[in-house]
């Protein structure tokens, strides 16, 4: 699965929430960022995430699509120089400071389950998705023969129109 260009084809600033409308928030604690899944107080502003969209080619062994076998991959950055990354050993999702080019662990295949819900599949571990477990983000293995619609891997993106990365 190779990224076909080093720069994103588009970017958007969005808030990220679970299928059950809990917010994904990011907090700086002891010089590292923690990720929380929580009900937001009404007056609290939602945290923003910069989504960068990249085109990716299916491995030719996997698909007969040839030039058309493209997927959208995203990276998610809630604050400058930090990106969500898959830790496949620990089955966890972590925020790490990185320089470009970003490691493969920072890329997720975008799945539109419905028009307004998305899932994020780990580039480094196909079949493993960002999901919600015990009020935290985790990596969750999904059996493709089962329904990909399990709510704990579904997220909503609410795009924010003025695009300034903090």
């Amino acid at each position: 699965m190779s990224i076909t260009g080093i720069s994103p084809i588009t970017e958007s600033l969005a808030s990220l929430s679970t299928y059950n409308d809990q917010s994904i928030t990011f907090a700086l604690e002891d010089e590292s960022y923690e990720i929380y899944v929580e009900d937001l107080k009404k007056d609290k502003k939602k945290d923003k995430v910069l989504l960068s969209y990249y085109e990716s080619q299916h491995p030719s062994s996997e698909s007969g699509d040839g030039v058309d076998g493209k997927m959208l991959m995203v990276t998610l950055s809630p604050t400058k120089d930090f990106w969500l990354q898959a830790n496949n050993k620990e089955h966890s999702v972590e925020l790490h400071k990185s320089e470009k080019p970003l490691p493969d662990q920072a890329f997720f295949v975008l799945h539109n389950r419905s028009f307004n819900s998305v899932s994020f599949e780990s580039k480094t571990d196909p079949g493993v998705f960002i999901g919600v477990k015990d009020n935290h983000l985790a990596l969750i293995k999904v059996d493709y023969s089962e329904n990909l619609g399990s709510e704990n891997i579904l997220f909503k993106l609410s795009e924010i129109h003025h695009h300034h990365h903090h």
């Epitope: 084809i9 698909s63 699509d65 058309d68 997927m71 959208l72 389950r113 028009f115 795009e159």
Partner: antibody, heavy 121, light 106 residues
Framework: EVQLVETGGGLVQPGRSLKLSCVAS????????MYWIRQAPGMGLEWVSS????????YYLDSVKGRFTISRNNAENTVYLQMNSLRSEDTATYYC??????????????WGQGTLVTVSS | DIQMTQSPSVLSASVGDRVTLSCKAS??????LDWCQQKVGEAPKLLIY???NLQTGIPSRFSGSGSGTDYTLTISSLQPEDVATYFC????????FGGGTKLELK
């Protein structure tokens, strides 16, 4: 090579039904959202319906809701549009299109040649 | 629902001209916009996706730009084979086409 072949169009009386089929080849069908778009004679394009890659989510133009049903058979690489209670304003060429990206509802990259549906008494 | 308005509805230009087609959305569509070309008697063909990305096999004289609600398709040097109707199309919220711009030769 990507190919989409629509069939099932024809002349039908108002109030009757018609089922369109679109057979796909040249790509991994089950990975892609599929769409129906129509074009009335001499007019512009109008999105009609969408279905996600596993068939679990479907979307419709307001004017066809409750009358049209989109479905797919991933084993047979086919997407369908069942059209009931047809009206004269449904007269159009109906195109089938595939999503631009695997798993994604963003954009569509290939279109079939279309099948003409004429609703007239 | 998002409405897409294309202008002009008909455009006459000469071979070699730089041609600009406009598409305006009723709400911000976050660059979720494509352009397609339809020649008489043919199915539409994708030219540009996500506002400014050229579809494989499309000549580089075609380019797209824009953001928010305002988008543009530019043909840097019009060729006879570019005579067609051009449609913009948004997929930010539902799926909606513009009314089209018919491009003809002077």
């Amino acid at each position: 090579e990507v190919q989409l072949v629509e069939t099932g169009g024809g002349l039908v009386q108002p109030g009757r039904s018609l089922k369109l089929s679109c057979v796909a080849s040249g790509f991994t069908f089950s990975n892609y959202w599929m769409y129906w778009i129509r074009q009335a004679p001499g007019m512009g394009l109008e999105w009609v319906s969408s279905i996600n890659n596993d068939g679990g989510n479907t979307y419709y133009l307001d004017s066809v809701k409750g009358r049209f049903t989109i479905s797919r058979n991933n084993a047979e690489n086919t997407v369908y549009l069942q059209m009931n209670s047809l009206r004269s304003e449904d007269t159009a060429t109906y195109y089938c299109a595939k999503g631009h990206y695997s798993y994604s509802s963003y954009s569509f990259s290939y279109w079939g040649q279309g099948t003409l549906v004429t609703v007239s008494s | 629902d998002i409405q897409m308005t294309q202008s002009p509805s008909v455009l006459s230009a000469s071979v070699g001209d730089r041609v600009t087609l406009s598409c305006k959305a009723s709400h911000n569509i976050n660059k979720h916009l494509d352009w397609c070309q339809q020649k008489v008697g043919e199915a539409p063909k994708l030219l540009i996706y996500f506002t400014n990305n050229l579809q494989t096999g499309i000549p580089s004289r075609f380019s797209g730009s824009g953001s928010g609600t305002d988008y543009t398709l530019t043909i840097s040097s019009l060729q006879p084979e570019d005579v067609a109707t051009y449609f913009c199309f948004q997929y930010n919220s539902g799926w909606t086409f513009g009314g089209g711009t018919k491009l003809e030769l002077k």
